[in-house]
């Protein structure tokens, strides 16, 4: 049994780091493998992660962490029984993938303005709370070409757009994702999408 693709890990910078790797053949990850992880700190305790299958030869492990600070560094040991298959290290602050925003809501009752709001996925005491910026994706269910991205570079988790920038009388969907420039993170996953029917009064044309 050998590791074909070494583990790569990302942290949500809160409580979970996710590591993925590939074996050289079909593997029952949960029965055959264990990923041990340990904070590099005097007298820190080793923890065991039981991996799950992620495709035939792929494995994924969700490492539970108390919290994360920039100084943290973890050692990682991948074991198959008594055999050490791979040894490495992981600094969560250097591999951050933020949590996805939640509770995306479209408010359509504000005159002819659409107000999209969502929740910051971090609690106020987490470093990322005040460092997230967002991308909002809006698309038409009827017209695949009607697809747009709005970059929200301010901290408030909301976006206002004129309803008239979208077509009237058809259904749209929206979703949002986050990233943090301070840690050069990857983008989060997209939030679940939300759907609404776009309708607004066309301005009365005078001739």
């Amino acid at each position: 049994m050998k590791v074909l693709q070494e583990p790569t890990c990302v942290s949500d910078y809160m409580s979970i780091s996710t590591c993925e790797w590939k074996m050289n053949g079909p593997t029952n990850c949960s029965t055959e493998l264990r990923l041990l992880y340990q904070l590099v700190f005097l007298l820190s305790e080793a923890h065991t992660c039981i991996p799950e299958n992620n495709g035939g030869a792929g494995c994924v492990c969700h490492l539970l962490m108390d919290d994360v600070v920039s100084a943290d560094n973890y050692t990682l040991d991948l074991w198959a029984g008594q055999q050490l298959l791979w040894k490495g290290s992981f600094k969560p602050s250097e591999h951050v993938k933020p949590r996805a925003p939640g509770n995306l809501t479209v408010h359509t009752n504000v005159s002819d303005t659409l107000l999209l709001t969502w929740s910051n996925p971090y609690p106020p005491d987490n470093y990322l709370y005040n460092h997230l910026t967002y991308a909002v994706n809006i698309w038409s269910e009827n017209d695949p070409a009607d697809f747009r991205i709005y970059n929200v570079t301010y901290l408030e988790p909301s976006l206002r757009i004129a309803a008239s920038t979208l077509k009237s009388g058809i259904s749209y969907r929206a979703r949002v994702r986050a990233w943090a420039q301070c840690y050069n993170t990857t983008w989060s996953e997209w939030s679940p999408s939300t759907k609404w029917h776009n309708s607004y009064r066309e301005p009365f044309e005078q001739h």
């Epitope: 904070l39 700190f41 005097l42 820190s44 305790e45 065991t48 108390d66």
Partner: antibody, heavy 118, light 107 residues
Framework: EVQLVESGGGLVQPGGSLKLSCAAS????????MHWVRQASGKGLEWVGH??????????YYADSVKDRFTISRDDSKNTAYLQMNSLKTEDTAVYYC?????????WGQGTTVTVSS | AIRMTQSPFSLSASVGDRVTITCKAS??????VAWYQQKPAKAPKLFIY???TRHTGVPSRFSGSGSGTDYTLTISSLQPEDFATYYC?????????FGGGTKVEIK
């Protein structure tokens, strides 16, 4: 919210024994090492000893001043750490704190007072 | 055992002052130094570890620095709630050892 509550302190004669308890809540107790630290009145902090988690085979470490007299144990099912103190001396008189160890001693109990006097 | 020598033993300062406390280890402890604050009749609280990393909830006016054997805790602008005793500790090796403490008093 992480909470540590010590109990079991009191007055004991030199040569006597006492067992302190530290009840933990608000975190997964079994995953953390636990320390005991003491402080004589008006003095500084003195590390007493430490017990590691099951993943480290419940290894224990002690300060030279208490070695062979004090024993640290834990019961993960009760979320409790213990400090068994035997052959107590007057110089063991202090407030005893239990602390969680993660990145240093990140949470402390309120302390329990042990007085060794005849 | 590694000895941690803290200075000064005590100091008097006013609100708004910049305060510096030093700790010298008897050998290189590779930035494995923590700082604790203790108020009268209360348990100590962790403020800094790894020499410079603030613990959750610790105000930014507290900063730690140092390397090798010499470490410093700085309070950039002393506030009324900062009057307390501060202890350094090495977390480089067992036995864990503390400095003797520095009492910060109101001038």
């Amino acid at each position: 919210e992480v909470q540590l509550v010590e109990s079991g302190g009191g007055l004991v004669q030199p040569g006597g024994s006492l067992k302190l308890s530290c009840a933990a809540s608000g975190f997964t107790f079994s995953m953390y090492g636990m320390h005991w630290v003491r402080q004589a009145s008006g003095k500084g902090l003195e590390w007493v000893g430490h017990i590691r988690s099951k993943s480290s085979n419940y290894a224990t470490y002690y300060a030279d001043s208490v070695k062979d007299r004090f024993t640290i144990s834990r019961d993960d099912s009760k979320n409790t750490a213990y400090l068994q103190m035997n052959s107590l001396k007057t110089e063991d008189t202090a407030v005893y704190y239990c602390t969680r160890w993660f990145r240093a001693m990140d949470y402390w109990g309120q302390g329990t007072t042990v007085t060794v006097s005849s | 055992a590694i000895r941690m020598t803290q200075s000064p033993f005590s100091l008097s300062a006013s609100v708004g002052d910049r305060v510096t406390i030093t700790c010298k280890a008897s050998q290189d402890v590779s930035t494995a130094v923590a700082w604790y604050q203790q108020k009268p009749a209360k348990a100590p609280k962790l403020f800094i570890y790894w020499a410079s990393t603030r613990h959750t909830g610790v105000p930014s006016r507290f900063s730690g620095s140092g390397s090798g054997t010499d470490y410093t805790l700085t309070i950039s602008s002393l506030q009324p709630e900062d009057f307390a005793t501060y202890y350094c500790q090495q977390h480089y090796s067992t036995p864990l050892t503390f400095g003797g403490g520095t009492k910060v008093e109101i001038k």
